[in-house]
Amino acid sequence: VPDKTVRWCAVSEHEATKCQSFRDHMKSVIPSDGPSVACVKKASYLDCIRAIAANEADAVTLDAGLVYDAYLAPNNLKPVVAEFYGSKEDPQTFYYAVAVVKKDSGFQMNQLRGKKSCHTGLGRSAGWNIPIGLLYCDLPEPRKPLEKAVANFFSGSCAPCADGTDFPQLCQLCPGCGCSTLNQYFGYSGAFKCLKDGAGDVAFVKHSTIFENLANKADRDQYELLCLDNTRKPVDEYKDCHLAQVPSHTVVARSMGGKEDLIWELLNQAQEHFGKDKSKEFQLFSSPHGKDLLFKDSAHGFLKVPPRMDAKMYLGYEYVTAIRNLREGTCPEAPTDECKPVKWCALSHHERLKCDEWSVNSVGKIECVSAETTEDCIAKIMNGEADAMSLDGGFVYIAGKCGLVPVLAENYNKSDNCEDTPEAGYFAIAVVKKSASDLTWDNLKGKKSCHTAVGRTAGWNIPMGLLYNKINHCRFDEFFSEGCAPGSKKDSSLCKLCMGSGLNLCEPNNKEGYYGYTGAFRCLVEKGDVAFVKHQTVPQNTGGKNPDPWAKNLNEKDYELLCLDGTRKPVEEYANCHLARAPNHAVVTRKDKEACVHKILRQQQHLFGSNVTDCSGNFCLFRSETKDLLFRDDTVCLAKLHDRNTYEKYLGEEYVKAVGNLRKCSTSSLLEACTFRRP
């Protein structure tokens, strides 16, 4: 019989008492085969973290800073359940640390040196740790003691709780630096008042502070937020302009064998019976013998953290950077305006080889990082392990939802002004063999399908979106008799046609022979009835243009396109017979790397782009003999986006809406994780 006990870790006598009450009340409402609580008492949160890692306890609720400690080796804990605040309809699990300034003050984030600063308190998250952590490498050396470095960076500050004797500049704006509400500039409201009164130039607070202190929109409009990309935004745009997004209070567990489903089952039932306004005799979010015992008193309930989300993703790149800077205190030798090498994310073995050759030829401007799937690459770019990659539109959507931005677009048509003219897009088509003359768009049910990969534009999002509108359900593996859609569940009929061997079967990378445009077309040639690809795929792999044995004798005339009106047309008539127009593939990166990725890639394409004529003796960035490694092989150049510099603007309203509709069919664990951080 599996042990269904969750050992909760308590850090004080009062917590232990509440834990025992929690245990006893849960026993009274949950059947004997349901989850139960046991209580383990430790002296501190760090002791609780160690106990969970050592399998002496299972769960504890932590503030963000401790979630970071819990994640570090050898603890390796992960977030499993989040407390939420506000209403069930609009649950808030995160707050945003922001830098507020007056509208007319005219400086940016990179111009804070010499300004006057208002902090909620020394060592507090939004008011100190996050802003000082992010500014850490700009502080004058020596950076230890930290207070002295901060005092020398700003021209004056109010940092309540600082030592006014040793660091008088930190108390210049609030004599005495009192560590309670007796100091008018203490806490969130106090730091904002310090700015409002004109004592300081910038206040480091949380996003809600300004709304709590200024009910009137006209008053709020006198203030702006400083963004990390050295721009400013209105105060209500905090989701797009903040220093960090911080989880409020989180239950953590072991990454392996951590009982996360059991913990959720327990807490979900607990909130049903003892949540806000549920029971008089025991209340989960109330602490009669103290404050915030086990859970925050202000919490309204729990939400399950998506399983794909590790602590790094949950805490976010900015928060992790800030805390790591403060803890480790390491900075590059001397901060320069020089761009660091761009870490390109390569999918599996074949892309890695091409990336390595690029790295050697770039003489250190490009470095390579490997991952097994596109989603793993996106996650690595999010957390800073990698910087950039080129993505199909479907993954540009997921990357955008995860906070990444498009920076350059692949262009596929030769033109005099290639780099300045991003194209409208390419065509997603459905290809069939000419010999299967009875096959049309209207009778695909029960046929064998070939897809580039799950989540990609031409191979999945467009055809499956159209199909969903017809069949109104997501069971595509029942609609087709079998197929190859790399990235599907391995036991799905949509992996049955795939050709990868062993663990590589149906993997969404080049180890699966039917992956990508060329792979999906090969699947049609060898096994399938219909392939969902781009309009250039057939001509690129017929007429001897692909020398591989399976393709070398193929003739374009032996294939036709399915049109949405139920007719068929020759391959060259794609402009009048396609499923939809697809946005070109685009390079994505984090906002903080946007300028450098743009600059380095433009240099690289001038060296190794389409201007290189002999690819047998020279490195060519856009060639890999029909394998589309790192970039599509038909890329002519990488083009500037001009104002299409967000994923919504780049993909266009129509495509974003189409993918949004298909979201209910999404199997993307990364998309689920990212929409948890930003619904």
Epitope: H350, E351, K354, E357, V363, N510, G617, F619, R623, L629
Partner: nanobody, 117 residues
Framework: EVQLVESGGGLVQPGGSLRLSCAAS????????MAWYRQAPGKGLELVSG???????NYRDSVKGRFTISRDNSKNTMYLQMNSLRAEDTAVYYC???????????WGQGTLVTVSS
Amino acid sequence: EVQLVESGGGLVQPGGSLRLSCAASGSIFSIATMAWYRQAPGKGLELVSGITRSGSTNYRDSVKGRFTISRDNSKNTMYLQMNSLRAEDTAVYYCTDYSSRYYHDYWGQGTLVTVSS
């Protein structure tokens, strides 16, 4: 297609030196980029160093200042001079020419370098 054969490996003490050679059966003059990879026991393949046709070189951080890559087009050979060897340099070393454009799964026998006291 160019065939490559690695040699020069062996057992060496920490701090010692070795010179690896990679001999090509055809001309390497036209090959754009050549590289040395290594695979330590139980680990994945990693790029150690690469050299372009014009002689530009690149090294992974952990070997910078200790290893030197070179090529002699007239002898159809590439070299890796390894100095100040450390235990963590123990691996099978392979050379590759990238001429088959990335998706070949052919690797030679490699040459084993063991750094141990």
